[in-house]
Interface confidence: medium
Amino acid sequence: HGTELPSPPSVWFEAEFFHHILHWTPIPNQSESTCYEVALLRYGIESWNSISNCSQTLSYDLTAVTLDLYHSNGYRARVRAVDGSRHSNWTVTNTRFSVDEVTLTVGSVNLEIHNGFILGKIQLPRPKMAPANDTYESIFSHFREYEIAIRKVPGNFTFTHKKVKHENFSLLTSGEVGEFCVQVKPSVASRSNKGMWSKEECISLTRQYFTVTN
């Protein structure tokens, strides 16, 4: 057997809604022929399934084999290094991979201007891999919240944060003109999931958007 291969130092999941990626750190001094074996355990079925015999990358997309994540007790994964006939011990994820580990995101933010208001509509994520019945709003059916950050360019303020409890919001601009840039971070009040800020969407507000009322 020769010298034993060292195990990958760490293995962890990074997940968004129906985008479940397993990551690991490489073993020290790996050779060009070193690759990694990935196995998956579903809680309640106490046996390991081999998913990939020889991955040469440092991550693996497990979405397709964890589609029931949102209706299950979760998963553990393990990875070991393989080099020819040699292999290391397994390194197992430290924590159970469950719905709680999924980072919440939004699909996009649409902005429009109406009579001095900026109207925002939050589009929920619609990943291609998700089964038809597993929408964001069916899985997170209650207590959806969004933190809104608005930056005005140029202007005398950087951010205004607001928690809204639905997918629409409006901001009265009170005569301010300029470019307004909006980001949204989702959360679910009853859950501990982390949220990720969306990319910034901007809209320009000029005097033409204001109507005069007597």
Epitope: K163, F169, S174
Partner: nanobody, 127 residues
Amino acid sequence: EVQLLESGGGLVQPGGSLRLSCAASGRTFSSHTVGWFRQAPGKGREFVSAITWNGDTTYFGDFVEGRFTISRDNSKNTLYLQMNSLRAEDTAVYYCAAATGQVWSLQYLRESSYAYWGQGTLVTVSS
């Protein structure tokens, strides 16, 4: 009529922290958007931060850069401004102010939207 009384100012070294308080009496504090403005020596009053009646919306001036947090305790009729990583340019008199109205609006960035003002508390950042 709302009366506002600021406290918590003082001398602090650069990089230090201070927590300002604003105690309100008179009309119901909890129905107002309240905020902080500041006035540096020889300069005009500038917007620092504001918070809506239920605390779900906060506003910050562009110089804040994440260093300050604003909060309120309606049961104690008190507004707070936690100031961290203070710089010499933060030296100013800090004023507490209360506005009427509850819409999510940029009007709260303007001095003219605030009907009630405190007397101010001096913050000096110096080594």
